[in-house]
Each structure stands twice: as structure tokens, then as C-alpha cells.
């Protein structure tokens, strides 16, 4: 079945733009002028999840790379990573799990619950420079909450 | 405050074509997604498609080649571009704000802008 | 494509009363239904989402229930300003939103 797609980007609270640091980890940082072009473009993608009043489940894939965002257990602690997949295969309509994140939208600001570990946020560290990771709180110190701008090809 | 103004339409003929525009204020074209919905005159609601970023158009089935929607993000104004038009188009025309990210629902209409396609 | 269909297409009914109409998918659509209220020459208004969320400022006596492909809404005491036309709409279920043909709400 066909998908429902659209490209973005995603900036935290405090305007933290989201870069790829490495092949395989996203880092959070305030960027200006035309550093803004090294922010990563995310296709997100609307899948099937479990219902829910204010959440819609969502893939977010890096546009035009092989990449998504997806949560496993390592070591034992609900982890954020970028997992290749095939590109012939996804997006799909019924994503495993570990993709599926719950978008929660109030006010225009994001937040993404992992489907996989309900409670675990995808966040940011106050710090700048610091990995995007899996965070088990709300409303302490990390970043939880993003807004969304679309981006035109 | 939120508001959606539509403006373009008026009376057209049978194979002609027509742009409609819906200016937003209130809120950014760059984060909110935007559909239009069209009613035959003492008809139903049918959704023609949405537009969220510019490469990422969806649209019914039947308006798939005739219709196109379009947004200039810095102008706050969607369009609709209507080709090969048909008496069975004439309807009055709403742009929609989605309610939130692929919820599907629209939380904002504009007041309809009404297009007679006729000879 | 999937359809849905509303009925009944009119209801007659009386200030006071409880009126319940009902949306049929033809097929599962989950949770992904919306009803709107629309009044002559006015545009839509959205009432409720997810099946079952009031939207914000729609009074309590309007509810919304059901999953899967039967849905239903109800008002629990109608009042005068009640008295408008009633659309589902399919708002997920892949690519294409799809609406019902309408319930009218009339006065007896």
C-alpha cells in the first residue's frame, strides 16, 4: 500500500538544528547563515501503530539515504539509532516497531515516543554538540519537545 | 488569529482552466499541511488532495492529472490549479488547515470560493 | 478507495431529544474517523477526531464512538443550533481521505 510521506527538518526547543555526526549518529547544535544547509532532511512517513487519541505513528527516515531512526535494547537501555534497511522495501505501510515512533503534536511542537519502548522520547541534551538519543523523562533537563519545517526538493 | 481567505473563483467553460488561491494568516505554511475539499451545489464534501512540502502532493483519484496543488510558502498562499475543466466540477472550493501531521482532519476551513464551469 | 456510508441521510428529530447517526467504512479504518458539522452556506466545522476526541470548543453533549469500520455520533440533548448537516470522513486508512454522503439533521 502507498504511503503518505513528507520531507522536513527537526529542531529542538532551544533551536538546535540536527546534523549526522558519523554514519550512523545524528548531533544536536545551533546552527546559522549557511551552516543551516548541514542539517538533515527527514522522510517522514505516516504507518499503521496502535490507536491512540494523540498519537500518530510515524517512520522517520533520512531523505534520500538508506537510514531510519529505530530503537533497540542495548545493554539493556531502550537506544537510539540509524539502521540501514532496503531501499526497495521502505517506506512500507506496516513498519517493524523498533521504527515506529508516536507523534504527539500540541501547539506545534513535536514529540516522538518510541512504539517500541512506550515513555522513551527521542531527545536532546542541553549541551550543544551532544548525540540525539532515547530519553526515559519528560520535562527535566533534556529536550523532548521539536518543531517541524517542511522542505521543498 | 487563524483565518483562510480563497479567492479565483467565477464562471468558466467546459475545457478551460482555473487557479484558485488561499491566502493563511495566523499561523506557517511551512509547518502545517493544506488540503482542499470541494461541494457540488446541494451536494456532499469530497477531498481533491493535500499538499505538505512542495514535492509532497496527494490527491482523490479522480483529480490525479487535472488538478494540482501548489504553495508559496512565503507569499502564505496554497493554490489549486484546475485544467480540462467539466460541468460536474462546479462546486464551491474550501482550503483546509490539517488539524496536526497526517491526522487527516482539518481544524480550519476558509469560506469557499464557488466555481461554474459552464458555456 | 475505500467509502463510507452515513445513515440515515435525514433525521427528524426534536429539541431535547438524543439523535445518534452512523458511519460504515468498507473496510477497517481503525481509529481514523472524523465528524464535522456543517450549516447552509457555512463551511465545515470540526467536531470530533480519532473517533472519539471532542475538538476544541465542541459542547459535551456531542460524543463519538466505535473502531474498526462502524462509528457512530451522538448528541445527547439536541439543541436549536444543532439542526445542520453531519459528515464522517475517513481521515487515514493510506493515501486517500474519503468523506460520507451526509446526514441531515431536521426539525420534526
Known amino acids: 500500500a502507498p504511503v503518505r510521506s513528507l520531507n522536513c527538518t527537526l529542531r529542538d526547543s532551544q533551536q538546535k538544528s540536527l546534523v549526522m555526526s558519523g554514519p550512523y549518529e545524528l548531533k544536536a547544535l545551533h546552527l546559522q547563515g549557511q551552516d543551516m544547509e548541514q542539517q538533515v532532511v527527514f522522510s517522514m512517513s505516516f504507518v499503521q501503530g496502535e490507536e491512540s487519541n494523540d498519537k500518530i505513528p510515524v517512520a522517520l527516515g533520512l531523505k534520500e539515504k538508506n537510514l531510519y531512526l529505530s530503537c533497540v535494547l542495548k545493554d539493556d537501555k531502550p537506544t537510539l539509532q540509524l539502521e540501514s534497511v532496503d531501499p526497495k522495501n521502505y517506506p512500507k505501510k506496516k513498519m517493524e516497531k523498533r521504527f515506529v515512533f508516536n507523534k504527539i503534536e500540541i501547539n506545534n511542537k513535536l514529540e516522538f515516543e518510541s512504539a517500541q519502548f512506550p515513555n522513551w522520547y527521542i531527545s536532546t541534551s542541553q549541551a550543544e554538540n551532544m548525540p540525539v538519543f532515547l530519553g526515559g523523562t519528560k520535562g527535566g533537563q533534556d529536550i523532548t519537545d521539536f518543531t517541524m519545517q517542511f522542505v521543498s526538493s | 488569529e487563524v483565518q483562510l481567505v480563497e479567492s479565483g473563483g467565477g464562471l468558466v467553460q467546459p475545457g478551460g482552466s482555473l487557479r484558485l488561491s488561499c491566502t493563511v494568516s495566523g499561523f506557517s505554511l511551512s509547518s502545517y499541511a493544506m488540503s482542499w475539499v470541494r461541494q457540488a451545489p446541494g451536494k456532499g464534501l469530497e477531498w481533491v488532495g493535500i499538499?505538505?512540502?512542495?514535492?509532497?502532493?496527494y490527491y482523490a483519484s479522480w483529480a490525479k492529472g487535472r488538478f494540482t496543488i501548489s504553495k508559496d510558502t512565503s507569499k502564505n498562499t496554497v493554490y489549486l490549479q484546475m485544467n480540462s475543466l467539466r460541468a460536474e466540477d462546479t462546486a464551491v472550493y474550501y482550503c483546509a488547515r490539517e488539524r496536526a501531521i497526517f491526522s487527516g482532519d482539518f481544524d480550519y476551513w476558509g469560506q469557499g470560493t464557488l466555481v461554474t464551469v459552464s458555456s | 478507495d475505500i467509502v463510507m456510508t452515513q445513515s440515515p441521510s435525514t433525521l427528524s428529530a426534536s429539541v431535547g431529544d438524543r439523535v445518534t447517526i452512523t458511519c460504515q467504512a468498507s473496510?477497517?479504518?481503525?481509529?481514523?474517523l472524523s465528524w464535522y458539522q456543517q450549516k447552509p452556506g457555512k463551511a465545515p466545522k470540526l467536531l470530533i477526531y480519532?473517533?472519539?476526541t471532542l475538538a476544541s470548543g465542541v459542547p459535551s453533549r456531542f460524543s463519538g464512538s466505535g473502531s474498526g469500520a462502524e462509528f457512530t455520533l451522538t448528541i445527547s440533548s439536541l439543541q436549536p443550533d444543532d439542526f445542520a448537516t453531519y459528515y464522517c470522513q475517513n481521515t487515514g486508512g493510506g493515501i486517500n481521505i474519503a468523506f460520507g454522503q451526509g446526514t441531515k439533521l431536521e426539525i420534526k
Open positions: 480519532r473517533a472519539s
Open positions: 473496510q477497517s479504518i481503525s481509529s481514523y
Open positions: 499538499i505538505y512540502d512542495s514535492a509532497s502532493t
